[in-house]
């Protein structure tokens, strides 16, 4: 009787334990499958594309972006797949030859046709944003600016893409979209903290980077200042991105891009020239170039220096002296007048600089050419290198950089000097804060610049609120997979023990 009772108990217990083990294994397997499948949904990858044309003052560039459709609102999923530089000058130079605009855009638009799958053409948006070169043309004549844009629109409408229009963006937009671009690419809008960083400039904190953009006709500075209140509402922007509020300062200095700054400097210096020879410290010794006075006064940027000269042309003769060039450049910045607590120059409000800055576009191109983009190069070293570079004879420079177009090559001394002057005297960076400037060309394969931010905004890909994230973070996913795998392993071991050594397992159960 006792034996029967004992065997019944054993049978009951073993059945229950087997049932529990079986149930646990099934749960673990289901959990593993569920977690695995939820996390790694085998959806057909639906890729979307977007095209933005940056119609700058000196040239036009076409950028193609792609992103997975399912992750449209995620941060950091859009990346650049192609950049095509249009051959020729900026669109504002086509005012006398608008009939050539169609041909001008052909190569890059055809390249876009090749890169983007044909099935996607009709749903790929195309945006063209024109910047300071066209702002200057519009300042001279709205009719001429309209005419250029009309022809551009007609040309772009002939392609199979979803053309969304061509417009002149404001300086504020240019600054803001550049700021959005670099912070998006640096992962600053992501609310998840990372255990490791794959972005070279990325600090683990979520503090945004400031943006320093230099073009041919304008320059922009945009950052989140420490003090939330602003003395100048014109320079204040409010964003809500991914559930967080940002109070941003931005200003665009029209005519202070590197090319227009050079025209300004020449117009200023020729005023005091005794004859038609301009000895210029911003060009290498031995460099010579003839400039038409009519070209000098063509731009509104030189209007304040305009005067009747006793000659139609003058010759620039380089003398290659960094210090004198620096002094000449400083005269472009009026720092004598400031109606605010602090100004950049020309009476424009500038709050105290805060945090790290990404300096891109021509800031990067020029400093990269001069080999001065390294984080380790101090401001003093940069100045030293510039002194050395500017004093090199023109013939020597031409030999050393035989592959570089002379027009560009001749201007690196001025451009480098101008960048230093703008950053130090214009924006008030110091030798100490210089290390907070990071000269950036690309971030994870995407060019730093306003175009990505512009497209993200126009395609509504930056939500105001933090979107519902993927079902699990990577760490939670790994943890759950390990946990359920362990459960399965333990269940398997216990099962083996039960069936191989049952007496050992039951011996104390009476």
């Amino acid at each position: 009787m006792e034996d029967t009772k004992e065997s019944n108990v054993k049978t009951f217990c073993s059945k229950n334990i087997l049932a529990i083990l079986g149930f646990s294994s099934i749960i673990a397997v289901i959990a593993l499958l569920a977690v695995g499948l939820t996390q790694n949904k085998a959806l057909p990858e639906n890729i979307k594309y977007g095209i933005v044309l940056d119609a700058g003052s000196s040239h036009t560039s076409l950028y193609i972006y792609k992103w997975p459709a399912e992750k449209e609102n995620d941060t950091g999923v859009v990346h650049q797949v192609e950049e095509c530089r249009v051959k020729g000058p900026g669109i504002s130079k086509y005012v006398q030859k608008v009939n050539e605009i169609g041909i001008y855009l052909t190569d890059c638009m055809e390249r876009a046709r090749e890169v983007i799958p044909r099935s996607q053409h009709q749903e790929t948006p195309v945006y063209l944003g024109a910047t300071a070169g066209m702002r200057l043309l519009r300042m001279e004549s709205e009719e001429l600016a309209d005419r250029v844009l009309d022809v551009v629109e007609r040309s772009l409408s002939n392609y199979p893409f979803d053309f969304q229009g061509a417009r002149i963006i404001t300086g504020q937009e240019e600054g803001a979209y550049g700021w959005i671009t670099i912070n998006y690419l640096l992962g600053k809008f992501s609310q998840k903290t990372r255990w490791f960083s794959i972005v070279p400039y990325e600090t683990n904190n979520q503090e945004t980077f400031g943006a320093l953009d230099l073009g041919g006709a304008s320059t922009q500075i945009t950052f989140v200042p420490q003090n939330q209140t602003t003395e100048s509402p014109d320079n204040a922007l409010q964003f809500r991105l991914y559930g967080k509020d940002y109070n941003v300062y931005t200003h665009s200095f029209l005519c202070y891009g590197k090319d227009q700054a050079l025209w300004q400097k020449l117009a200023k210096d020729i005023q005091v020239a005794s004859n038609e020879i301009l000895r210029d410290p911003c060009f290498h010794p031995g460099y010579k170039k003839v400039v038409n006075v009519s070209d000098l006064y063509k731009t509104p940027c030189t209007k304040r220096f305009e005067m009747t000269l006793p000659f139609q042309q003058f010759e620039i003769q380089g003398i290659g002296n960094y210090q004198q060039c620096h002094q000449s450049v400083l005269e472009l910045f009026n720092t004598s007048y400031c109606p605010y607590s602090q100004c950049a120059f020309n009476g424009i409000f500038l709050p105290p600089l805060q945090g790290d800055f990404g300096a891109f576009s021509a800031f990067y191109f020029v400093m990269n050419f001069l080999n001065l983009t390294s984080e380790k190069v101090s401001q003093e070293k940069v100045t030293e290198m510039m002194k050395k570079f500017c004093s090199q004879p023109w013939e020597e420079i031409k030999t050393s950089y035989a592959g570089v177009k002379e027009k560009y090559l001749s201007e690196y001394c001025f451009s480098g000097t101008y960048i230093l002057s703008l950053l130090l005297q214009g924006y008030h960076f110091t030798a100490d804060s210089w290390e907070h400037i990071h000269f950036i060309g690309k971030i994870q394969g995407s060019d730093a610049g306003w175009t990505l931010g512009y497209m993200l905004n126009l395609t509504n890909m930056i939500p105001a609120e933090q979107p519902l994230s993927t079902p699990l973070s990577h760490s939670t996913y790994v943890f759950l997979m390990v946990l359920f795998s362990l459960v399965l392993v333990i269940v398997a071991i216990i099962g083996l023990l039960i069936f191989h050594k049952p007496s050992y397992f039951w011996k104390d159960m009476v």
Epitope: M139, E142, E143, D146, L254, P300, K303, R304, F305
Partner: antibody, heavy 116, light 111 residues
């Protein structure tokens, strides 16, 4: 929306100077030139000159060269037109107008009366 | 200076009828394929209002009954069907070169 608001009417004696202001809003002040145009009673519109607010450079009609001065205060988004050595024939409504070559936006006008 | 000559000096048109104003420039006001010719409407006590720019483009908010044509030196403003609110003085202007000049004006009234 773009708005240009001018200062009030002025009465001046011959030989004196007058300074009319034009406060702009609704756009980036330094992105467009500011022109000044006047209209004497029953007369055609007459262009005085313009300023590039970006840098303060200005251009005038030969008729007003040396007598008219146009200035700006970019921090206040305001343009000013000063006319000196006033004579009775300067009695007119003075307008500011925004534009490069297209005067799409005008101030409401400021009546300047020159009378002894 | 480019002289702008408007004709007629005044014009009386019945409501719903067509009104045509001409403007002749002393030299071509075309440049880079654009006519730097503008038409403005001015009512008593008000600043001028831009009607037509670039000779033939309508200003924003301008009724379709206003149209402009011409190039070079000869230009026309047409009001296809005159309305009571169109009673005003109309001016042409060139901005091809400094000094920018205006026509003498055409007074439009209802017959």
């Amino acid at each position: 929306q773009v708005q240009l608001v001018q200062s009030g009417a002025e009465v001046k004696k011959p030989g004196a100077s007058v300074k009319v202001s034009c406060k702009a809003s609704g756009y980036t002040f330094t992105d467009y030139n500011m022109h000044w145009v006047r209209q004497a009673p029953g007369q055609r519109l007459e262009w005085i000159g313009y300023i590039v607010p970006l840098n303060g450079g200005s251009t005038f009609s030969q008729k007003f060269q040396g007598r008219a001065t146009i200035t700006v205060d970019t921090s206040a988004s305001t343009a000013y037109m000063e006319l000196s050595s006033l004579r009775s024939e300067d009695t007119a409504v003075y307008y500011c107008a925004r534009g490069g070559t297209r005067f799409a936006y005008w101030g409401q006008g400021t009546l300047v009366t020159v009378s002894s | 200076d480019i002289v702008m000559t408007q004709s007629p000096d005044s014009l009386a048109v019945s409501l719903g009828e067509r009104a045509t104003i001409n403007c002749r420039a002393s030299e071509s006001v075309d440049n880079f394929g654009v006519s730097f010719m503008y038409w403005y409407q001015q009512k008593p006590g008000q600043p001028p209002k831009l009607l037509i720019y670039g000779a033939s483009n309508q200003g924003s908010g301008v009724p379709d009954r206003f149209s402009g044509s011409g190039s070079g030196t000869d230009f026309t403003l047409t009001i296809s069907s005159l309305q009571a609110e169109d009673v005003a003085v109309y001016y042409c202007q060139q901005t091809k070169e400094v000094p920018y000049t205006f026509g003498g004006g055409t007074k439009v009234e209802i017959k």
